[in-house]
């Protein structure tokens, strides 16, 4: 049977259906891939340009293969088994009305099915299987793969690799309620917040009294100590870590191969030798990089640094004086860490709303 011979796969949504918002389509495919990555060691990364392993497209009729679409109804989509070129690709008939509900044709359900083919699964004769050849509506919010589907995909790729457990190192540093404690980098990671310091990090669930501590090397042996900036793109399960002129990508808590990469590939000028802090704003789909007295803005959709940057922090972030240690995005606010203190900043009204101890997250 055909299968991918690698764990890390890329996908690209070549074009979008006009039936839905682009961000809904992006989210649906991210969730459809997650259905399969949750039960296998496979990891998926979205590309915005170039050839991906799995190219996704919406098309009418003849569209570049022998398998013409037939108009509304009938064939909803088709996908190719793993391999080079067109192999692995998934095509959706634009003549259908694609939706995220029970009306029309639910894109999520068809996507999970087609991506099953893209990963090497054949049709199933079990009506409870998502690989059953006939479309039927199921509630996407409560959707679960059948035991058959899990068994079949795991026969190709095996069970998921457990994410490394966040355990306590043997000699934790002294209490974090120390008055002058500062952090190297702070970011959300899923529902948790990670506070990086030297060779370790603290992590906690907001609102929970429990605080945990883990050495960086125990969870990610390939990542160095002394991380200087970090941000998360939660919708993609991606965590980016920066040190000096390099950065690393952690996907679903697993480091991506072919990293570290140079920060200059992101569009920084040669004068930038390190990033002080970074934060991703999901509402704007921008990453803000803080470097000395300036900040840079990166567009994650276009994968390009925005023109006319860098700009002065003090001019565009009123009330914020350099130098910045770390920035956290949490509940539509930026938390800007400077030494033993942090400023709660509202980016909508462009003003500082609170000054707090940097350790306030730990109940200090």
């Amino acid at each position: 049977r055909s299968r991918w011979m690698k764990r890390y796969l890329t996908y690209r949504i070549y074009n979008y259906t006009p039936d839905m918002k682009r961000e809904d389509v992006d989210y649906i495919f991210q969730k459809a891939f997650q259905v399969w990555s949750d039960v296998t060691p496979l990891r998926f990364r979205k590309l915005h340009k170039d050839e991906a392993d799995i190219m996704i497209l919406f098309a009418f009729g003849a569209h570049g293969d022998f398998n013409y679409f037939d108009g509304k109804g009938g064939t909803l989509a088709h996908a190719f088994y793993p391999g080079p070129g067109i192999q692995g690709d998934a095509h959706f008939d634009e003549a259908e009305t694609w939706t995220k509900s029970f009306q029309g044709t639910n894109l999520f359900l068809v996507a999970v099915h087609e991506l099953g083919h893209s990963l090497g699964l054949q049709h199933s004769n079990n009506p409870k299987s998502i690989m059953y050849p006939t479309y039927r509506y199921l509630n996407p919010s409560t959707f679960r793969l059948s035991a058959d589907d899990i068994r079949n995909i795991q026969s190709l790729y095996g069970a998921p690799v457990k994410p490394p457990s966040l355990t306590k190192p043997s000699s934790p540093p002294s209490t974090f309620c120390h008055q002058s404690l500062s952090f190297d980098a702070v970011t959300t990671v899923g529902e948790k917040i990670f506070f990086f310091k030297d060779w370790f990090f603290w992590w906690k669930l907001p609102g929970s009294p429990a605080t945990n501590i883990t050495s960086i090397s125990s969870i990610w042996p390939s990542i160095p100590s002394g991380i200087q900036a970090a941000y998360e793109i939660e919708s993609r399960n991606q965590l980016f870590l920066f040190k000096d002129e390099k950065y690393w990508l952690i996907n679903n808590l697993v480091p991506e191969p072919h990293y570290p990469r140079s920060i200059y590939s992101l569009g920084f000028s040669a004068s930038v030798k390190k990033v002080d802090a970074a934060v991703f704003d999901p509402l704007r789909q921008k990453v803000y990089f803080f470097v000395d007295k300036h900040y840079w803005r990166y567009d994650v959709r276009q994968e390009l640094m925005d023109p006319a940057y860098p700009k002065l922090i003090s001019t565009h972030f009123p009330g914020i004086k350099p130098k910045i240690d770390a920035v956290l995005y949490f509940k539509r606010h930026y938390y800007i860490f400077q030494g033993a203190y942090q400023l709660e900043y509202d980016p909508l009204f462009r003003r500082v709303t609170k000054t707090l101890k940097s350790t306030s997250w730990f109940g200090c």
Epitope: A59, F66, F80, Q87
Partner: antibody, heavy 122, light 103 residues
Framework: EVQLLESGGGLVQPGGSLRLSCAAS????????MHWVRQAPGKGLEWVSG????????FYADSVKGRFTISRDNSKNTLYLQMNSLRAEDTAVYYC???????????????WGRGTLVTVSS | DIQMTQSPSSLSASVGDRVTITCRAN??????LNWYQQKPGKAPELLIY???SLQSGVPSRFSGSGSGTDFTLTISSLQPEDFATYYC?????FGQGTKLEIK
Amino acid sequence: EVQLLESGGGLVQPGGSLRLSCAASGFTFSPYWMHWVRQAPGKGLEWVSGIGPSGGLTFYADSVKGRFTISRDNSKNTLYLQMNSLRAEDTAVYYCAKDIRGAYSSGLFDYWGRGTLVTVSS
Amino acid sequence: DIQMTQSPSSLSASVGDRVTITCRANQSIYTYLNWYQQKPGKAPELLIYAASSLQSGVPSRFSGSGSGTDFTLTISSLQPEDFATYYCQQAGIFGQGTKLEIK
């Protein structure tokens, strides 16, 4: 090593019939789409027909539809092209080509035979 | 129906030259375009698939680019063995071919 060897070509009169064969070796034949592509003397390439792994799915160029039939015998690792009602414009070298694996044909031909010449003339 | 238009139909060049052949589809074929090389009396050979992926064993002087309707095949520095006819192809449709001859 993948090898495709066509046979069955020759001289035939207009309106006549011919059956081409393509013997495949060096790979597992059954999971792959297979195709026939032809080339008239001094002209370009023209796709003729394609067949799915099990033989149930077939495609034809409009120029041969209703006259040519593609088939395969997976137990013999052989592809066939039955050509009926032949016309002068069917004169060409006929190549057998292997597609890459898939439930659907990609039309990506990674291996080709050397071809067999079919001449339709009175 | 999808149609492929290849240009030029013939081309004269010298060893060491950089050569570009173009192929245009009358509607989007995404990145589903392949390039083949054919030498006289021989079967075609796959050079590039999916617009830009080099087939195993093909020299790196060959490259492909494009997406949607416009595609190019580039030979960065012509070698004597590169003089042949080149075809673009998408599913059951071939371009009419470009004959590359020695100047």
